[in-house]
């Protein structure tokens, strides 16, 4: 069974107890008392059911990573010490760890280190000190999710704001505006049209249109609304039909333009 010609080489695994916060690296050191010609160094974790996982190994000057690449073995320059590190430790990495050195044939022998315990604690937000440390970084997936949700919300809010602005502003802009001096006075048509007219422009207020602004609709010619413009203090003459853009330039209406109706 045991090989008498090979000394039982003590194997150390330190620290015996290690506590790290989640997300930090946890590093044990496995040390051989001597360096045999041919050996394998395994890194194990004991599970609660007394079963084990081999996390990683070192054999014949090369690292054999396990299934989880977070577990890394590094040989130090002195040749007999090995760093066994868990990158970005998780809460469920807590447990019992050890290393095992196997001397290879012709004198096969297994040597196990003492056990060491790792405790991974939840990351706590510490109160700010003299130089406050940055908050813990979220994990990649969570960070992406937060950014994505925030982007969508901002986009929706901007869209709602744009819709509200357009709904509030655009109907007036498309319909145009004018003032009417007296809605009670009917338009008088007579043969004696005055050669010069003065127009007072302002906002035409329709009480019956007071309701929630509707989203802007494209202006089609058949949807044009008309208002009667009364020219106060002068005998009325045939008015002029104009488009919203023609309201920009104040020109007197000419008799051939038809009835005194202005589009809104």
């Amino acid at each position: 069974l045991d090989s008498p010609d090979r000394p039982w080489s003590p194997l150390t695994f330190s620290p015996a107890q290690l506590t790290v916060q989640e997300g930090e690296n946890a590093t044990f050191t496995c040390s051989l008392a001597d360096i045999p010609d041919s050996f394998v160094l395994n890194w194990y974790r004991l599970s609660p059911r007394n079963q084990t996982d081999k996390l990683a190994a070192f054999q014949e000057d090369r690292i054999e990573p396990g299934r989880d690449r977070r577990f890394r073995v590094t040989r130090l320059p002195n040749g007999r010490d090995f760093h066994m590190s868990i990158v970005a430790a998780r809460l469920n990495d807590s447990g019992i760890y050890l290393c095992g050195a196997i001397y290879l044939p012709p004198n096969t022998q297994i040597n196990e280190s003492p056990r060491a315990e790792l405790s991974v604690t939840e990351r706590t937000l510490e109160p700010p000190t003299q130089s406050p440390s940055p908050p813990p970084r979220l994990s990649g997936q969570l960070q992406g999710l937060v950014i994505g949700v925030t982007s969508v919300l901002v986009g929706v809010l901007l869209l709602l704001l744009l819709t509200w602005v357009l709904a509030a502003v655009f109907p007036r802009a498309t319909r145009g505006a004018c003032v009417c001096g007296s809605e009670d006075e009917p338009l008088k048509e007579g043969p004696d049209a005055a050669p010069v007219f003065t127009l007072d422009y302002g906002e035409l207020d329709f009480q019956w249109r007071e309701k929630t602004p509707e989203p802007p609709a494209p202006c089609a010619p058949e949807q044009t609304e008309y208002a009667t413009i009364v020219f106060p203090g002068r005998p009325a003459s045939p008015g002029r039909r104009a488009s919203a853009s023609s309201l920009q330039g104040a020109q007197p209406p000419s008799p051939e333009d038809g009835p005194g109706l202005w589009p809104l």
Partner: nanobody
Framework: QVTLRESGGGLVQPGGSLRLSCAAS????????MTWFRQAPGKDREGISC????????IYADSVKGRFTASRDNAKDTMYLQMNNLNPEDTAVYYC????????????????????WGPGTQVTVKP
Amino acid sequence: QVTLRESGGGLVQPGGSLRLSCAASGLTFGLYAMTWFRQAPGKDREGISCISSSDGSTIYADSVKGRFTASRDNAKDTMYLQMNNLNPEDTAVYYCATDYETRCDYGLRLRDRTAYWGPGTQVTVKP
């Protein structure tokens, strides 16, 4: 001092059953895959079953598949081999051995990954 000790062998008639045990001491039993080997008179030693430490998965040689079942109890540092429907060709000395791997990834061939052997237990199948 690492020791392995087999037990449960004996004389049995064809079609009969036996249950072998392999008790380990001096090592963390749960760290290592365990293999059952056998050696019939005048023949080479052959691997017949391996059971992983990590998940208890097993592999079997074709000659025993469907008749033999390996199991382990890490809390008791013991491995078992339930042998059913035995026939005279199963007559051999049965050995248990520790592997220095946790899994049976290397098959059943006799290999230098076997670290320790037990002394063996004799199984004889005859009418």
